[in-house]
Interface confidence: low
C-alpha cells in the first residue's frame, strides 16, 4: 500500500479529465507513470550498492517538480537540475557506451559486458527508458491523454528536454576511450540530428576523453562493405578530430556473433573476425 498511498493524488483516469485539457499530437503519459518511476528507482538502488544512499521519494519529488504545473512546451534543462543532482553517478574511464538508433543491441551488449554502461544503465536513464510524461500549466495533474510531439508540437517538451539534459551530462562526465554503437543499416549511419550527433558528440570533453571508437553494426549477413568509409562516418571523424579527440572505427559484420563472443570470448570461432 506504500506506493498507492504516495501516489493516490496522482491517479486520474482519462475519462475523468476536463474536456478543455490541451490536446497534443503525441501519446499521453505512460500509464502508472509515478508508480513505475518509483518502483524502478527502488529496484535500481537495491541492485546497485553504490546508489543505496538514494532516497527514491526525493528522486520522484525532483522528477515531478521538473514538469508538474509547467507549460509542457516550455521545459528547460534547469528544471531537471535537482533531479540530475540527486542522480549523480560516475562511470569508470573507458566504460561508457553511447549508441544511436540501435538501442536494443547496445543494451544487450551491456547486459553481457557488465562493466560497460549505456545511459539507460545509469539511474536516471533507467528510470525514464521508454516512458512518456507531461503535465499541464497551473494544475498538479499529469496528462495521461496527450503530450507534445517533438516535431508536430515543440522540442522543449518534458521528455525531449530530459533526454537532452541527461545525455549531455552523461557525455560530459565520460573519460578515457568512449565507445559508440551506430546502426549501419540506416541511410545516415551518423546522424547529426540524433541525440548522439547533436548533444553527446559536442559534450565529450577533450581533456578527459582520449578517443571515440565507433562500432558500425551491419544488418545484412552478406554485407562485407567497409562502412567505416561511409561519408557520414567521415563527417563524425571530422567533428571529433576538430575537438582534439582521436577517432577509431570498427565494422561489426556479425552482431549476433559479436554478442556471442562477448559472452564466450574463448570460443574458437571468436578468433576470426566478427
Amino acid at each position: 500500500s506504500g506506493l498507492n498511498d504516495i501516489f493516490e493524488a496522482q491517479k486520474i483516469e482519462w475519462h475523468e479529465l476536463p474536456r478543455w485539457r490541451q490536446q497534443w499530437s503525441g501519446s499521453g503519459t505512460t500509464s502508472r507513470f509515478p508508480e513505475t518511476v518509483l518502483a524502478r528507482c527502488v529496484k535500481y538502488t537495491e541492485v546497485h550498492p553504490e546508489m543505496r544512499h538514494v532516497d527514491c521519494q526525493s528522486v520522484w519529488d525532483a522528477f515531478k517538480g521538473a514538469f508538474i504545473s509547467k507549460y509542457p512546451c516550455n521545459i528547460t534543462e534547469e528544471d531537471y537540475q535537482p533531479l540530475v543532482k540527486l542522480g549523480t553517478q560516475t562511470v569508470p574511464c573507458n566504460k561508457t557506451l553511447l549508441w544511436s538508433r540501435i538501442k536494443d543491441l547496445a543494451h544487450q551488449f551491456t547486459q553481457v559486458q557488465r562493466d560497460m554502461f549505456t545511459l539507460e544503465d545509469m539511474l536516471l536513464g533507467y528510470l525514464a527508458d521508454d516512458l512518456t510524461w507531461c503535465g499541464e500549466f497551473n494544475t498538479f495533474e499529469i496528462n495521461y491523454q496527450s503530450c507534445p510531439d517533438w516535431r508536430k508540437d515543440c522540442s522543449n517538451n518534458p521528455v525531449s528536454v530530459f533526454w537532452k539534459t541527461v545525455s549531455r551530462r552523461f557525455a560530459e562526465t565520460a573519460c578515457g576511450v568512449v565507445h559508440v554503437m551506430l546502426n549501419g543499416s540506416r541511410s545516415k549511419i551518423f546522424d547529426k540530428n540524433s541525440t548522439f550527433g547533436s548533444v553527446e558528440v559536442h559534450n565529450l570533453q577533450p581533456e578527459k576523453v582520449q578517443a571515440l571508437e565507433a562500432w558500425v553494426i551491419h544488418g545484412g549477413r552478406e554485407d562485407s562493405r567497409d562502412l567505416c568509409q561511409d561519408p557520414t562516418i567521415k563527417e563524425l571523424e571530422s567533428i571529433i578530430s576538430k575537438r582534439n579527440i582521436r577517432f577509431f572505427c570498427k565494422n561489426i559484420y556479425r552482431p549476433d556473433k559479436f554478442l556471442q563472443c562477448v559472452k564466450n570470448p574463448e570460443d574458437s570461432s571468436c578468433l576470426s573476425g566478427i
Epitope: T88, T90, V91, P92, C93, E172, T173, A174, C175, G176, Q205, P206, E207, K208, V209, Q210
Partner: antibody, heavy 117, light 110 residues
C-alpha cells in the same frame, strides 16, 4: 557530505619549495577535474592548474609552468608541488573540483602559504 | 593571455534594490557560454552562483540571474539583501584549455 580540504600551507623562505595536498572526503576523484586556485591577500582569484582525474591530463596557467606541478596521488588526494617560491606567491591556496570542466562547484576552505625571509 | 574585466567596483546598493555587474572577456569564451559567477565573503572560499552564463547553481536564490554570450556577460542581483554583501567574480573557460577569473566586484549593501 562531499568536502575538499587543503593542507601543507606554511611559512617558507624565498627560493624554497612546498607541497600542498588536496584531500576529498565523502567522494573520490573519478571523472572530475581537480584544480588549484590562489588568492593573494586582498586580491582576486588566480587559476594555477588542473588535473583530470580520469585521463591524468594536466593543464597549467602560462605563468605557473615549470615552477608548479600538479599530480593525483590517490583516488582522494591531489598535490601541488611549488618550487622557487617568491614573495609574490604568498596567498591562500584553494583546491576546487569541477565535475564537468568549466566551473568549480566544490571548494576547499583554503590553506595559507607565506613566503618571507 | 585572456583578460576578464569586471565593472564597476565597488558597487553600492540599497536593501531591496538591484545590482548589475558586468564582465567583459578579451576574447570569446568557449562555446560562447562557458562563463561562471561566484560569490566570496571574507575568510571563505568562493561559492558557485551561476554556470554556463545563465544557469542558476543548486541552492542559489532566484534573486540572482545572469545573461550574456561571447565576450559580454552580466550578473544581476534583484531585491538585494544585506547577506549579499560580498565580492563577486566571473570566471571564463577557454578551449586552450585555460581558465581566467575577473578581478572581482565588491558589492556594498547600505
Amino acid at each position: 557530505q562531499e568536502q575538499l580540504e587543503e593542507s601543507g600551507g606554511d611559512l617558507v623562505k624565498p627560493e624554497g619549495s612546498l607541497t600542498l595536498t588536496c584531500t576529498a572526503s565523502g567522494f573520490s576523484f573519478s571523472n572530475d577535474a581537480i584544480c588549484w586556485v590562489r588568492q593573494a591577500p586582498g586580491k582576486g582569484l588566480e587559476w594555477i592548474a588542473c588535473i583530470y582525474a580520469g585521463s591524468g591530463n594536466t593543464y597549467y596557467a602560462s605563468w605557473a609552468k615549470g615552477r608548479f606541478s600538479i599530480s593525483k596521488t590517490s583516488s582522494t588526494t591531489v598535490t601541488l608541488q611549488m618550487t622557487s617560491l617568491t614573495v609574490a606567491d604568498t596567498a591562500t591556496y584553494f583546491c576546487a573540483s569541477a565535475d564537468t570542466i568549466d566551473y568549480f562547484n566544490l571548494w576547499g576552505p583554503g590553506t595559507l602559504v607565506t613566503v618571507s625571509s | 593571455a585572456q583578460v576578464l574585466t569586471q565593472t564597476p567596483s565597488p558597487v553600492s546598493a540599497a536593501v531591496g534594490g538591484t545590482v548589475t555587474i558586468n564582465c567583459q572577456a578579451s576574447q570569446s569564451v568557449y562555446n560562447n557560454n562557458y562563463l561562471a559567477w561566484y560569490q566570496q565573503k571574507p575568510g571563505q572560499p568562493p561559492k558557485l552562483l551561476i554556470y554556463r552564463a545563465s544557469n542558476l547553481a543548486s541552492g542559489v536564490p532566484s534573486r540572482f540571474s545572469a545573461s550574456g554570450s561571447g565576450t559580454q556577460f552580466t550578473l544581476t542581483i534583484s531585491e538585494v539583501q544585506s547577506d549579499d554583501a560580498a565580492t563577486y567574480y566571473c570566471q571564463a573557460y577557454y578551449r586552450d584549455p585555460t581558465t581566467a577569473f575577473g578581478g572581482g566586484t565588491e558589492v556594498v549593501v547600505k
